[in-house]
């Protein structure tokens, strides 16, 4: 069983390497941004924009949203290609979990305050769902403060 | 050297059938999506089919949905495409080629291309 | 379906010269999916540049790209030899993945 276990973490690990988590990071901060734009924030405002070139550049996603983004533009391709990114981890719940843990890691630095990761976390959960795929069961999605790309 | 190797063209009759297969080397295979690309006689460029590393995902063009089925061995590194009730309108080059994306920021692409096997569809 | 429509059919420059093709989509297309080919007679396809600005391996750096959402251009600055070919754009985002018709950049 070990053996086993401990080829599945490694087919996993190969399997997360060969992943294109970016189009989910993409969907997810889109969708988080659009949620607080309805909700009476200024869409143009670059004081809030996680992405804002005001911010550290090296931070700055080239591919992320703009405001004119906002509006949905590109957002059902961030969701098709990463639907099919997490589609290749459908018969491996554990992986499927280290996959999601790793878009919030990777984006953990970009969320700005409590109520934008609690938001991130919350969408994220419900990623698989959207996808039409099993959601794993049991997946922590905390991450240390001061959390790092794993690309 | 990364290569890709296309097959299985030939002459055939409308509503006939051919398989073509791409074999490749010179990478690990089933790291990649996978995609047929084809050209009618002096035209563009049209996409036919993609197929993801584990075969999860396939998607056709509208042109070849229910005649065409696009699969992949990973064990012998290769891809194929069974081309059924084939049309006038089917004759062309048919490339396969690999896609990857860019690790840091996420773009896919076909970076890899084979020279194509040609499929000329005439009574 | 995204339809992606290439303009001018044909662009006749000469070398020195710059060139600029227009790539416009039937609806917004994220730059992360827009991708740029060169393809000579007899011969496959050449990535060219992926989401929408970045140059692949080995491109050099007269080739250049721009936009979002709905229009997209390359720019070549100054036109050698063997630049003179068809560039095609694609979208790669959402299924079916579509070409642009082409742009054939011929030498005048």
């Known amino acids: 069983r070990q053996q086993w276990e401990l080829q599945g973490d490694r087919r996993c690990q190969s399997q997360l390497e060969r992943a294109n988590l970016r189009p989910c990071e993409q969907h997810l901060m889109q969708k988080i941004q659009r949620d607080e734009d309805s909700y009476g924030r200024d869409p143009y405002s670059p004081s809030q924009d996680p992405y804002s070139p005001s911010q550290d550049p090296d931070r700055r996603d080239p591919y992320s949203p703009s405001p004119y983004d906002r509006r949905g533009a590109g957002s059902s391709q961030h969701q098709e290609r990463c639907c099919n990114e997490l589609n290749e981890f459908e018969n491996n719940q554990r992986c499927m979990c280290e996959a999601l843990q790793q878009i919030m890691e990777n984006q953990s630095d970009r969320l700005q305050g409590r109520q934008q990761e609690q938001q991130f976390k919350r969408e994220l959960r419900n990623l698989p769902q959207q996808c039409g795929l099993r959601a794993p069961q049991r997946c922590d999605l905390e991450v240390e403060s001061g959390g790092r790309d794993r690309y | 050297e990364v290569q890709l190797v296309e097959s299985g063209g030939g002459l055939v009759k409308p509503g006939g059938s051919l398989r073509l297969s791409c074999a490749a080397s010179g990478f690990i295979f089933s790291d990649y999506n996978m995609n047929w690309v084809r050209q009618a006689p002096g035209k563009g460029l049209e996409w036919v089919s993609s197929i993801t590393r584990s075969s999860r995902t396939i998607y056709y063009a509208d042109s070849v949905k229910g005649r065409f089925t696009i699969s992949r061995d990973n064990a012998k590194n290769s891809l194929h495409l069974q081309m059924n009730s084939l049309r006038d309108a089917d004759t062309a080059v048919y490339y396969c080629?690999?896609?990857?994306?860019?690790?840091?920021?996420?773009?896919?692409?076909?970076?890899?291309w084979g020279n194509g096997t040609t499929v000329i569809v005439s009574s | 379906e995204i339809v992606l429509t290439q303009s001018p059919g044909t662009l006749s420059l000469s070398p020195g010269e710059r060139a600029t093709l227009s790539c416009r989509a039937s609806?917004?297309?994220?730059?992360?999916?827009l991708v740029w080919y060169q393809q000579k007679p007899g011969q496959a396809p050449r990535l060219l540049m992926y989401?929408?600005?970045t140059r692949a391996t080995d491109i050099p750096d007269r080739f250049s790209g721009s936009g979002s959402g709905t229009d997209f251009t390359l720019t070549i600055s100054r036109l050698e030899p063997e630049d003179f070919a068809v560039y095609y754009c694609q979208q790669n985002g959402n299924s079916p993945y579509t070409f642009g018709q082409g742009t054939k950049l011929e030498i005048k």
């Open positions: 609806q917004s297309v994220s730059n992360m999916f």
């Open positions: 080629a690999r896609e990857d994306f860019d690790v840091s920021t996420g773009p896919y692409y076909m970076d890899v």
């Open positions: 989401g929408a600005s």
